[in-house]
Interface confidence: low
């Protein structure tokens, strides 16, 4: 049959011991070179739905440190600087990919894992359930 | 320093042709089994800093589809439903890991890449610069 020319520089990943396995170069290419390094670093304090950042560390995971946002209040901060409980602070969550060392303590063997992280908080109008 | 004993079942990936290369099992383990699938799906509309979600697709990347948040307004929505320009809607950004196929057309070879994505928006008090 017709074959697509395989790039001659492709790694040989035919090892039968590693089904469902691909080769991954860990020399990370960062596409964010032109971004402001400060980014949203002070938004957690200036937001009407402020949050604290908690360090989640796991040496068997890459990246080993992930910062988790926890909303400071149930409500949102109003113009007077007080918490308004007619509004809700809620976490904005995102599923991210991480590499989990597998089998454990193997320096060169990982498995893809999806985890849900809270990135920050936003202020939303609550869903009010009216009782008949 | 203290060394963690290497698991005897570890793959041998000491091939000198593949510096910084590891084996990754693509059979994704999802740690989010107990999360509400709806999650923050309606926050983009209910937020005082609402956002739209734009589809970013790249067939040479995993995940191939990433949703990018774009804040709808410069200001935030007040209690009357109007845009208040004394406050600012800002994107909450996060660096995430993706897999990029490299070299091209190698079916089982990838490189880790960091990209910056906007996950949602939050309402912040603006930084006001007073002119003397």
């Amino acid at each position: 049959g017709i074959t697509i020319p395989r790039n001659p520089g492709c790694p040989n990943s035919e090892d039968k011991n590693f089904p469902r396995t691909v080769m991954v170069n860990l020399n990370i290419h960062n596409r964010n070179t032109n971004t402001n390094p400060k980014r949203s670093s002070d938004y957690y304090n200036r937001s009407t739905s402020p949050w604290n950042l908690h360090r989640n560390e796991d040496p068997e995971r890459y990246p080993s440190v992930i910062w988790e946002a926890k909303c400071r209040h149930l409500g949102c901060i109003n113009a007077d600087g007080n918490v308004d409980y007619h509004m809700n602070s809620v976490p904005i969550q995102q599923e991210i990919l991480v590499l989990r060392r597998e089998p454990p303590h193997c320096p060169n063997s990982f498995r893809l894992e999806k985890i849900l992280v809270s990135v920050g908080c936003t202020c939303v109008t609550p869903i009010v359930h009216h009782v008949a | 320093g203290i060394t963690i004993p290497r698991n005897p079942g570890c793959p041998n990936s000491e091939d000198k042709n593949f510096p910084r290369t590891v084996m990754v099992n693509l059979n994704i383990h999802n740690r989010n089994t107990n999360t509400n699938p709806k999650r923050s799906s309606d926050y983009y509309n209910r937020s005082t800093s609402p956002w739209n979600l734009h589809r970013n697709e790249d067939p040479e990347r995993y995940p191939s589809v990433i949703w990018e948040a774009k804040c709808r307004h410069l200001g935030c929505i007040n209690a009357d439903g109007n845009v208040d320009y004394h406050m600012n809607s800002v994107p909450i950004q996060q660096e995430i890991l993706v897999l990029r196929r490299e070299p091209p057309h190698c079916p089982n070879s990838f490189r880790l890449e960091k990209i910056l994505v906007s996950v949602g928006c939050t309402c912040v008090t603006p930084i006001v610069h007073h002119v003397a």
Partner: nanobody, 120 residues
Framework: QVQLQQSGGGSVQTGGSLTLTCAAS????????LGWFRQSPGKEREFVAA???????DYADSVKGRFFISRDNTMNTVYLQMNSLKPEDTGIYTC??????????????WGQGTMVTVSS
């Protein structure tokens, strides 16, 4: 050499059945999602079905309930069982392999294609 060798196909009457087979060689079979695309006369190539290495299966809406994809990792083979065939199923069916196929409906490795003709 990476190769996907197809067999099956041919002509059939409306309502008939056919099975397509695709045998892979030269790649880590289990590390790839495998699937089928088709190109009908005068149309773009379109996704038909795929099965991932996690055994997740996706079908195009137009073939759901009629076509069934399966894979045999011991034989490095993927199959497409096509039932209740319609004239609009006519086209060249091509096998595809790719680690990302299931998520992006695109592939880097293709078979040679095989013709399926459904007459009314």
């Amino acid at each position: 050499q990476v190769q996907l060798q197809q067999s099956g196909g041919g002509s059939v009457q409306t309502g008939g059945s056919l099975t397509l087979t695709c045998a892979a060689s030269g790649l880590t079979f289990e590390a790839n999602s495998l699937g089928w695309f088709r190109q009908s006369p005068g149309k773009e190539r379109e996704f038909v079905a795929a099965v991932s290495f996690t055994k997740r299966i996706d079908y195009a809406d137009s073939v759901k309930g009629r076509f069934f994809i399966s894979r045999d990792n011991t034989m490095n083979t993927v199959y497409l069982q096509m039932n209740s065939l319609k004239p609009e199923d006519t086209g060249i069916y091509t096998c595809a392999a790719d680690p990302l196929l299931i998520s992006n409906k695109r592939a880097n490795i293709w078979g040679q294609g095989t013709m399926v003709t459904v007459s009314s």
